[in-house]
């Protein structure tokens, strides 16, 4: 069974006090992730007895193997089930705690009745605060049955329940007619899936004795052993204030286990710690009880003694349960009550006996489940005791179950039952998962799901280059840490797997399936320098750059452009793909906008470092084009342009730009000011004759405006040729500029 | 063997001005920014100013903007600082150093020039 | 501007022993931070970039670590010619700025 406590502290004087703690003794609890299972979940379960609604109850973490909640305001508040839930998988577990109100009509007289399939189950309400109405009992919240107030036998209300089964299992209370469900009596019936001392499938395996009050598990044949109690038949006791499978938990606080109720996996329920009784487990057994619920009695024979936590505690000569077994009987001694072996391995198994006469070699045996006697191979004989040594053959899984040491003298006999479990080494599920990678290591998260049984002890990532013969490379992690493989090649893909170990020799499993991890080329070094950029239009801005001059070839795939809207707290970014580059045009960009530009080369997708910054502010944009441009030829070297005003003008027109060019020529265009933008006329001057121009024009505010619609006109014939174009505006004739 | 020479410095009044100079060798100068850094006698370093490889950039800080000038003559395997406007304040060891190819270090540093900046 | 703080101002220790020297970003500067060394009357010289990289020439007994806001510059056994100062750099935001430095005295 899962090794899963709730603990309830019932001293109630102060709700604000009271406070239920889950404890796991499992390997590997609460860690959380998938591969090692869920955490600790401990919660109140409104869905059968409902309270009214207070202030959040508070949940503390203390590690991952407990749990405790606290912020209990007023008694109300812990009326009620509450539950924990632990462990991994098919091993999830659900722990269930019942709380009655002390200060309620009716109280049970046991909260928790485990009883086996066939049975009757007697649920007793004794009365608390007498009422005269019937008494209404409800099976998980739901109706179930009525009892006439006068049907109170001894003070108390009883629901028999003959034949039970399974599904007759769950919350059951017992209330007053129209009295609060506060005021109720809550039960939990626990029934087993077998009939006494019996479990499995069909029931047909016999239980193993489960001792001091221990529940043997219908499903597993384990018994459930009270607190304060272990064992494989719960045969030994704990010390006082400890409880837990393996008696490794310890009761909080100076009274030890006092005023605590324990709650463990069904079918056990709930009970008082081991020494304690009483509704709030606050009294002592009295003389000769002991156990949980001081439900068990000593009957110490032989002088024995009893001890309220452990039962009888023998005289020198004698042991037993009850002290009923002379020393001279022989005995199994320090037998181990549970083991644990992995499959397919050859353990030793020692089984040590004391007695007179002494035990030999011969007269201890070993039976293993399906009935097999293997006889030691070797005994060691020391003068209080023979150990005696079994080689076991190699283990299968049907090995699991309940082994038998055995020692028989002519003084009599004695034998000591004990678990072996047999565990399947790990096996991972899936390839373990690339978190990031650089040129030179990977970032490796090996925790993986995995077929198998866990604890996961070690965990070994082996490596090498993918479609390689070499040895592998090995790595021996943490299982809850991520592993960087380092000092590998760039650029470089590489087959990694996962191997997982658990505990104990042969633990090692089988490697999981590779997966192919591709390192990250090298990082780019070089630093770039910006060396110039000019404003190519109120859009558009040529950036030019260098690199320093260092041997060997550039590590590098292109450069990243970046500007800088600060105003808008905007960025943009030009990728310039080419390594070789060292210019590049941005277009597109906002006008009038002051940018901080840098450049860096990149490599896969590595930045090198930025260049300096350079602030670029780049011209507003300018005013709408000139309207209806039109150009008429004067003579064999003028041509008289005119147009109209651009419409929607952002503010006065410091200039026009007249741009001339020799329909179908190859030459770079020709640009006139006309710097009287009153104008809306002028006469382009030193043109060639009977040859064919085209003209378009812009306005000018702070930046330069649209183009126009271009015009073409050609100058009248037979002129001499002209030394070139120049301009004369309508009211400007003295002065030309070219 | 990079070597770094600066040259240049000496006593000027406040408002006057000097020229620094660094000569380099040893190393292919037209392929590395340059700086100008400074010490104030008894104070740590402060950077001054920066050129690319080819002169076409250059960057200032803050407390110098406007007044010197950083330039070079590759021809000449040489670093300019011209100084204006100087002020007491500005008196220091001034540095020339290299840009380290991969970042803003600087790999190697000239021996310095003081500059004192009174009346 | 990234402001860099390096402490302690001063630190005395005899040689043979360890050095800690620290430096602390105004925000953080990733890796992107070196540390230089300079004697009396010379210039500095370049030890550490990058937060861990030794310059050419620097002995192993120098080596940087951290990342973020925090870094350190540890000499693992003092040699009578690293008593000098030392100054932390950034390069991750322009401009660059340096650490008011840490004097190394002999104890």
């Known amino acids: 069974a899962v090794d899963l406590t709730l603990l309830a502290n019932l001293r109630l004087t102060d709700p604000q006090r009271f406070f239920l703690t889950c404890v796991s003794g499992e390997a590997g609890a609460g860690r959380g992730s998938d591969a090692w299972g869920p955490p600790l979940l401990l919660e109140k379960d409104d869905r059968i007895v409902r309270t009214p609604p207070g202030p959040p109850l508070r949940l503390a973490r203390n590690g991952s193997h407990q749990v405790t909640l606290r912020g209990f305001s007023k008694p109300s508040d812990l009326v009620g089930v509450f539950s924990c839930v632990g462990g991994a998988g098919a091993r999830r577990t659900r722990v269930i705690y019942v709380h009655n109100s002390p200060g309620a009509h009716l109280l049970p007289d046991k909260v928790t009745h485990t009883v086996n399939k066939g049975d009757t189950a007697v649920l007793s309400a004794r009365v608390h605060k007498e009422k005269q109405t019937d008494v209404i009992w409800k099976s998980n919240g739901s109706y179930f049955y009525t009892l006439d107030w006068h049907e109170a036998q001894d003070g108390r209300f009883l629901l028999q329940l003959p034949n039970v089964q399974p599904p007759s299992s769950g919350i059951y209370s017992a209330t007053y007619l129209e009295a609060s469900p506060l005021g109720s009596a809550f039960f939990r019936l626990i029934v087993r899936g077998c009939g006494a001392g019996r479990w499995g499938p069909g029931c047909t395996k016999e239980c193993p004795g489960c001792l001091h009050g221990g529940v043997c598990h219908d499903h597993d044949g384990e018994c459930v052993c009270p607190p304060g109690f272990t064992g494989t038949r719960c045969e030994q006791a704990c010390r006082e204030g400890r409880f837990g499978q393996s008696c490794q938990e310890q009761c909080p606080g100076i009274s030890g286990c006092r005023g605590l109720t324990f709650c463990l996996p069904d079918p056990y329920g709930c009970s008082c710690g081991s020494g304690w009784r009483g509704s709030q487990c606050q009294e002592a057994c009295a003389p000769g009880h002991f156990g949980a619920d001081c439900r068990l009695q000593c009957q110490c024979q032989n002088g024995g003694t009893c001890d309220r936590f452990s039962g009888c505690v023998c005289p020198s000569g004698w042991h037993g349960v009850h002290c009923e077994k002379s020393d001279r009987i022989p005995q199994i001694l320090n037998m181990a009550s549970e083991l644990e072996f992995n499959l397919e391995t050859m353990p030793r198994i020692n089984c040590a006996a004391a007695g007179n006469p002494f035990p030999v070699r011969g007269s201890i045996e070993l039976r293993k489940p399906d009935g097999t006697v293997l006889l030691s191979t070797k005994a060691i004989v020391e003068p209080e005791k023979t150990t005696a040594e079994f080689e076991v053959p190699r283990l299968v899984l049907a090995d699991s179950g309940f082994w038998e040491c055995r020692v028989s003298t002519s003084g009599g006999q004695d034998s000591r039952r004990f678990k072996v479990n047999v565990k399947v080494p790990p096996v991972p599920l899936a390839a373990p998962r690339l978190l990031t990678k650089q040129s030179r290591q990977l970032v490796v998260s090996p925790l993986v799901s995995f077929s198998g049984d866990g604890p996961i002890s070690t965990v070994r990532l082996h490596y090498r280059p993918q479609d390689s013969t070499m040895d592998w490379s090995t790595i021996v992690v943490d299982p809850s840490e991520n592993v960087t493989l380092m000092n590998l090649r760039p650029k470089t893909g590489y087959s990694v797997r996962v191997q997982l170990s658990r505990p104990g020799e042969g633990g090692e499993g089988a490697w999981g399936p590779p997966t192919l991890m591709t390192t990250d080329c090298p990082e780019p070094l070089l630093q770039p320098w910006l060396e110039g950029w000019h404003v190519e239009g109120t859009d558009r801005l040529r950036v030019s750059w260098s690199l320093p001059l260092v041997p060997g070839p550039l590590v590098g795939d292109g450069f990243l452009l970046r500007l800088w809207d600060g105003t808008r707290g905007q960025e943009r970014r030009e990728n310039v793909s080419s390594p070789q580059a060292r210019t590049a045009l941005l277009t597109g960009l906002t006008p009038g906008t002051h940018y901080q530009l840098d450049v860096q080369l990149y490599h896969c997708t590595l930045l090198g470092p930025a260049s300096p910054p350079a602030h670029v502010l780049l011209p507003p944009s300018g005013p709408p084009a000139p309207r209806h441009l039109h150009a008429q030829a004067l003579s064999d070297s003028e041509i008289q342009l005119t147009w109209k005003h651009p419409e929607a003008l952002p503010g006065p027109i410091s200039k026009y730009v007249v741009e001339v060019q020799v329909a179908g020529g190859a030459g770079d265009p020709l640009w006139i000011d006309v710097d009287r933008p009153e104008e809306t006329s002028t006469i382009i001057r030193g043109l060639n004759a009977s040859t064919r121009y085209l003209f378009r024009m812009r306005a000018s505010i702070q930046g330069l405006g649209d183009w126009s619609n271009t015009v073409e006109e050609s100058t009248l014939g037979n002129g001499l040729q002209a030394e070139g174009p120049v301009q004369e505006s309508r009211a400007a004739e003295e002065g030309l500029d070219q | 063997e990079v070597q770094l020479l600066e040259s240049g410095g000496g006593l000027v009044q406040p408002g006057g001005s000097l020229r620094l100079s660094c000569a380099a060798s040893?190393?292919?100068?037209?392929?590395?920014?340059m700086y100008w850094v400074r010490q104030a006698p008894g104070k740590g370093l402060e950077w001054v100013s920066v050129i690319s490889p080819s002169g076409g950039y250059t960057h200032y800080a803050d407390s110098v903007k406007g007044r010197f000038t950083i330039s070079r003559d590759n021809s000449k395997n040489t670093l300019y600082l011209q100084m204006n406007s100087l002020r007491a304040e500005d008196t220091a060891v001034y540095y020339c150093?290299?840009?380290?190819?991969?970042?803003?270090?600087?790999?190697?540093w000239g021996q310095g020039t003081l500059v004192t900046v009174s009346s | 501007d990234i402001q860099m703080t390096q402490s302690p101002a001063t630190l005395s220790l005899s040689p043979g022993e360890r050095a800690t020297l620290s430096c602390r970003a105004s925000?953080?500067?990733?890796?992107?931070l070196a540390w230089y060394q300079q004697k009396p009357g010379q210039a500095p010289r370049l030890l550490i970039y990058d937060t861990s990289n030794r310059a050419t020439g620097i002995p192993a007994r120098f080596s940087g670590s951290g990342s973020g806001t925090d870094f350190t510059l540890t000499i693992s056994s003092l040699e009578p010619e690293d008593f000098a100062v030392y100054y932390c750099?950034?390069?991750?935001?322009?401009?660059?700025?340096f650490g008011q430095g840490t004097r190394l005295e002999i104890k």
């Open positions: 925000q953080s500067v990733s890796s992107y």
């Open positions: 750099q950034q390069r991750s935001n322009w401009p660059i700025t």
């Open positions: 040893g190393f292919t100068f037209s392929g590395y920014g």
């Open positions: 150093a290299r840009a380290y190819s991969s970042g803003w270090y600087l790999d190697y």
